[in-house]
């Protein structure tokens, strides 16, 4: 049986914590009901019981939904390309970033193209 609070203080006795940063409530089974939320503050961590309301209409899977731009050009130096996402919708209690950057490796084709472009520029 899960305890109401599984508290692990890593900062040692008497270490004061001003502000805790809490992750999302993760239900123990299915997508709602009782679960746990991890919190961190400095070197301290804390795990508390929480509940995702089952009357939340889970029409979208993730806590944070983003609208993405098209992928940027392949960076020959890093072999990756980047795109930016702007927050479109968040679950009410989800502390989502307003914008995110996603990188992914270039496909062999685009890698070759980027390298060829780089080579031409040096001539």
């Amino acid at each position: 049986v899960a305890k109401k609070k599984d508290k692990v203080k890593k900062g040692g006795p008497g270490s004061e914590c001003a502000e805790w940063a809490w992750g999302p409530c993760t239900p123990s089974s299915k997508d709602c009901g009782v679960g746990f939320r991890e919190g961190t503050c400095g070197a301290q961590t804390q795990r508390i019981r929480c509940r995702v309301p089952c009357n939340w209409k889970k029409e979208f899977g993730a806590d944070c939904k983003y609208k993405f731009e098209n992928w940027g050009a392949c960076d020959g130096g890093t072999g990756t390309k980047v795109r930016q996402g702007t927050l479109k919708k968040a679950r009410y209690n989800a502390q989502c970033q307003e914008t995110i950057r996603v990188t992914k490796p270039c496909t062999p084709k685009t890698k070759a193209k980027a390298k060829a472009k780089k080579g031409k520029g040096k001539d």
Epitope: R49, R51, K57, K89, A90, Y92, N93, Q97
Partner: antibody, heavy 117, light 107 residues
Framework: QVQLQQPGAELVRPGHSVKLSCKAS????????MNWVRQRPGQGLEWIGM????????ILNQKFKDKATLTVDISSNTAYMQLSSPTSEDSAVYFC??????????WGQGTTLTVSS | DIVLTQSPATLSVTPGDSVNLSCRAS??????LHWYQQKSHESPRLLIK???QSISGIPSRFSGSGSGTDFNLSVNSVETEDFGMYFC?????????FGAGTKLELK
């Protein structure tokens, strides 16, 4: 930062529906939940419901299911709440507020609704 | 619906005093508890979100604590501008609900 503009006052006759507006300016209106809250004279705060402008998903307090209808107009960055068949009991200040769990919320100044013949 | 009980109903203090306001939930709400201040004829202002997270622009004398069913708002060394109503609100389940409020007044 988001600014929410609401008309200062509205007067409506009993039984005549009224549509309250909440116009957003500043940061993206469409990314955040818009709440509507009622405060009767000298009373506390009562949550009516909320709507998400991106897809108009609405979660309504069951107490207001036959009273309030929430809508948004993305083109004008405006949220609306229509109150049907108002009575003197509906005379109150109505606030809109834009909520983000990350940054907190922003509130309109409130619209004082008077239901009187 | 989750009921939030605030105590005391009224708190009479002198500027410079430090105070604690309490909010108790009828069932566990994890840390989904927020504190608002409201002055007469004004809209509410968010002071603390998610039980203990500070809000940009809010003086550091305001702090929050608690989880589960018991929560506290502390005001360290009250200033005259702090007088008004204080409401707690839960966002753990629908409908969102508010406490009846604590009035912080001048002694």
């Amino acid at each position: 930062q988001v600014q929410l503009q609401q008309p200062g006052a509205e007067l409506v006759r009993p039984g005549h529906s009224v549509k309250l507006s909440c116009k957003a300016s500043g940061q993206s209106f469409s990314s955040y939940w818009m709440n509507w809250v009622r405060q009767r004279p000298g009373q506390g705060l009562e949550w009516i419901g909320m709507i998400h402008p991106s897809d108009s998903e609405t979660i309504l307090n069951q107490k207001f299911k036959d009273k309030a209808t929430l809508t948004v107009d993305i083109s004008s960055n405006t949220a609306y709440m229509q109150l049907s068949s108002p009575t003197s009991e509906d005379s109150a200040v109505y606030f809109c507020s834009s909520w983000s769990a990350k940054r907190g919320d922003f509130w309109g100044q409130g619209t004082t609704l008077t239901v009187s013949s | 619906d989750i009921v939030l009980t605030q105590s005391p109903a009224t708190l009479s203090v002198t500027p410079g005093d430090s105070v604690n306001l309490s909010c108790r939930a009828s069932e566990s709400i994890s840390n989904n508890l927020h504190w608002y201040q409201q002055k007469s004829h004004e809209s509410p202002r968010l002071l603390i979100k998610y039980a203990s997270q500070s809000i940009s622009g809010i003086p550091s004398r305001f702090s929050g604590s608690g989880s589960g069913t018991d929560f506290n708002l502390s005001v360290n060394s009250v200033e005259t501008e702090d007088f008004g109503m204080y409401f707690c609100q839960q966002s753990n389940s629908w409908p969102l609900t508010f406490g009846a409020g604590t009035k912080l007044e001048l002694k």
